[in-house]
Amino acid sequence: FGISGRHSITVTTVASAGNIGEDGILSCTFEPDIKLSDIVIQWLKEGVLGLVHEFKEGKDELSEQDEMFRGRTAVFADQVIVGNASLRLKNVQLTDAGTYKCYIITSKGKGNANLEYKTGAFSMPEVNVDYNASSETLRCEAPRWFPQPTVVWASQVDQGANFSEVSNTSFELNSENVTMKVVSVLYNVTINNTYSCMIENDIAKATGDIKVTESEIKRRSHLQLLNSKA
């Protein structure tokens, strides 16, 4: 490639998490080159025999790809010229977790960076009033989590209160025998209060809020991936 190997270019990755069964992104950027044909992108996974993905001379070169990644990877070919070497990983598997290396060769030099990729399942919780219950009860449900998360209830009025004695959480294995449905019930709920159902594992943290007043019910939920850092 016409380079001595002594020049190094800056390559930057971001640790990320993949939701199993869905598509994921392994992020990698580098100092761009003016000619696409001079750029080589290699993705490797520590411990895996073949390459995860290779892009060279403006196109994918998959003859050395490991079979565990066959048909599941793609780079954003139109963005390579501006320094985007990120990899799209289709149908994320639990076994995709591990350490990846984004290795770049350009006419300016070579560079690489590692990233930790975690895999699991995470989903947004939904909190509803359970009208079938004998007392005022809230029901928090999230369809897909793995590994098994913890569930903690909190309330705006009773800040710092421990609701473990008045709540019950169950985990039901989904049909694919990996992920689980999370159901948590909170009893003895008071009106004019905001309750939060917080679900967390080592990959993600999700919160479902519900505000119950005599006239209305307001819901809000959000999900945050943990340990996503450069």
Epitope: Q42, G47, M68, T95
Partner: antibody
């Protein structure tokens, strides 16, 4: 500490069998492909066999194909090499090695196999 | 099979010398080339992977370069602990193959 420790070497007659073991510690064994590499006395390095991280793929050097079998037991963090129909030219120090970034990044100390009548 | 040819097979050098070892592959192996150091009675040790990436813990006086069929291992300033045998290895296809080795001896 990341470590590989081979055992099972020894003196065996031509046509005999031997099973080598390689005990791994200090890393997630089940995430790594593993290799066997050998070195005949006073000679260079020769790759023998590899097994993928999940055991689904195995590759062998032509010189051992049909005689040697590589296997792994992730529950015991152990790699194996079953050697049958041994020949005098199989005499060597056998190393197990971890597959890191496209290379043998961690090596065991080796175990000597001597095939002689 | 891909043949790996190392040269020289042996060399004599002094402490502080710049040493260069070459490795040639019988066909294009891109950057899938590794270098190892082996001392008598010891297991080999990985120095360089992917042709030019320095393995963690390896002194920066070791460097690798090349792509395609021609590769070089350079020791910028030879130290007493560097006297050993060095091997290149291709990692692009099975069977994986090593060069014949280069023995670096004290002059």
């Amino acid at each position: 500490e990341v470590q590989l420790l081979e055992s099972g070497g020894g003196l065996v007659k031509p046509g005999g069998s031997l099973r080598l073991s390689c005990a791994a510690s200090g890393f997630t064994f089940s995430s790594y492909a593993m290799h066997w590499v050998r070195q005949a006395p006073g000679k260079g390095l020769e790759w023998v066999a590899v097994i993928s991280y999940d055991g689904s793929n195995k590759y062998y050097a032509d010189s051992v194909k049909g005689r040697f079998t590589i296997s792994r037991d992730d529950s015991k963090n152990t790699l194996y090499l079953q050697m049958n129909s041994l020949k005098t030219e199989d005499t060597a120090v056998y190393y197990c090695a971890r597959h890191g970034w496209d290379a043998f990044d961690i090596w065991g100390q080796g175990t000597l196999v001597t095939v002689s009548s | 099979d891909i043949q790996m040819t190392q040269s020289p097979s042996s060399l004599s050098a002094s402490v502080g010398d710049r040493v260069t070892i070459t490795c040639r592959a019988s066909q294009d192996i891109s950057n899938r080339l590794n270098w190892y150091q082996q001392k008598p009675g010891k297991a080999p040790k990985l120095l360089i992977y992917l042709a030019s990436s320095l393995q963690g813990g390896v002194p920066s006086r070791f460097s690798g370069s090349g792509s395609g069929t021609d590769f070089t291992l350079t020791i910028s300033s030879l130290q007493p602990e560097d006297f050993a045998t060095y091997y290149c290895q291709q990692a692009i296809s099975f069977p994986l193959t090593f060069g014949g080795g280069t023995k670096v001896e004290i002059k």
